[in-house]
């Protein structure tokens, strides 16, 4: 999906109002220094591409985050503010949800969510630079 035509301001507002709180809740008990940020992004569409990938694509050691509250809210936000996102992405991510067996917050998942927080911060920063 090409995130170029999204309403970035509205995505930022949703992130600051609600998604960020759920990401921080997920990370509770860990320190920001516990993980190194290895994933980066260069502009707003690129940041959303990376956020989409880390949130919804299963990885070997973190099966899927798609059922978490922050993921459901991310999906809703992208569906609302990125025209055409629902048609191209929702069915694909629905299938991934079925892969998740039990709700175990592994260290690898915590690391992945730490990367997500970094990507979202980067998304906000690139937004501020543009204004």
């Amino acid at each position: 999906y090409d995130f170029t035509n999204c309403d970035f301001q509205k995505i930022e507002a949703d992130y600051l109002r609600t998604i960020s709180k759920d990401l921080i809740t997920y990370m509770s008990g860990t320190k920001s220094t516990d993980f190194n940020n290895t994933v980066s992004c260069s502009n707003r569409p690129h940041c959303l591409t990376e956020i989409q990938s880390l949130t919804f694509n299963p990885t070997p050691r973190c099966a899927s985050l798609a059922k978490e509250m922050f993921a459901r809210k991310t999906k809703a936000t992208l569906a609302l503010w990125c025209p055409g996102y629902s048609e191209t992405q929702i069915n694909a991510t629905q299938a991934m949800k079925k892969a998740r067996k039990s709700k175990v917050t592994t260290n690898k998942c915590l690391e992945q969510v730490s990367q997500l927080l970094g990507l979202w911060r980067r998304f906000i920063r690139t937004l501020l630079k543009k204004q």
């Epitope: 509205k10 949703d14 109002r17 609600t18 609302l80 025209p83 055409g84 629902s86 048609e87």
Partner: antibody
């Protein structure tokens, strides 16, 4: 069963406000959009706005901006539509309609409608 | 004045086909594949018939079909039946600010 149940008919004076409720049951309320659509007697359908409780987003039709407020209480699975500064032209049946999950612009479930009459 | 334009009326005899048009702009119908159609019988709430231009809602007979060309969407009802007599409304997504636009409605009469 899966349904939307709206509050009863209202008679209001011009200049006053009305608040219509829409109680959802049988589905995960927060994940869907709750839209409000009205129909004046003998007229077509008109979209007022939508709320997506999951992310707390509301979008209003430009025509009603500043006059309509849509809210939701996830603890009771109830959405509300308040319309202020009522005039006779606001006399209509007001419907709440569920917007499909992540496809909030398709209304796949409707309430029974609430008749709001504005008369002095 | 509705943002999407529909003919006020359409008619056909039982067994015939009838097509209802819905004309918008490149900012709504032409810009997105997010057209839907609703059927409304007198005194009843509307019912979703077609979404995403041409997908039938569950329980809707395959006599109902949708299509789109440029800025115009169409609903075709083939093999008309008496119970198809109703008002039909098109809607289109119209961007993140306007969100949804309705057509003015078409009264379908089965002769």
């Amino acid at each position: 069963q899966v349904q939307l149940v709206q509050s009863g008919a209202e008679v209001k004076k011009p200049g006053s406000s009305v608040k219509v409720s829409c109680k959802a049951s049988g589905f995960t309320f927060g994940s869907y959009g709750i839209n409000w659509v009205r129909q004046a007697p003998g007229q077509g359908l008109e979209w007022l706005g939508v709320i997506v409780p999951l992310v707390g987003v509301t979008i209003y039709a430009e025509k009603f901006q500043g006059r309509v407020t849509i809210t939701a209480d996830t603890s009771t699975s109830t959405a509300y539509m308040e319309l202020s500064s009522l005039r006779s032209e606001d006399t209509a049946v007001y419907y709440c309609a569920r917007g499909q999950e992540y496809f909030y612009w398709y209304f796949d479930l409707w309430g029974q409608g609430t008749l709001v009459t504005v008369s002095s | 004045q509705s943002a999407l334009t529909q003919p006020p009326s359409a008619s056909g005899s039982p067994g015939q086909s009838v097509t209802i048009s819905c004309t918008g702009t490149s900012s709504d119908i032409g810009g997105y594949n997010r057209v839907s159609w609703y059927q409304q019988h007198p005194g009843k709430a509307p019912k979703l018939m077609i979404y995403e231009v041409n997908k039938r809602s569950s329980g809707v007979p395959d006599r109902f079909s949708g299509s789109k060309s440029g800025n115009t969407a169409s609903l075709t009802v083939s093999g008309l039946q008496a119970e198809d007599e109703a008002d039909y409304y098109c809607t289109s997504y119209a961007g993140t600010d306007t969100f949804v636009l309705f057509g003015g409605g078409t009264k379908l009469t089965v002769l």
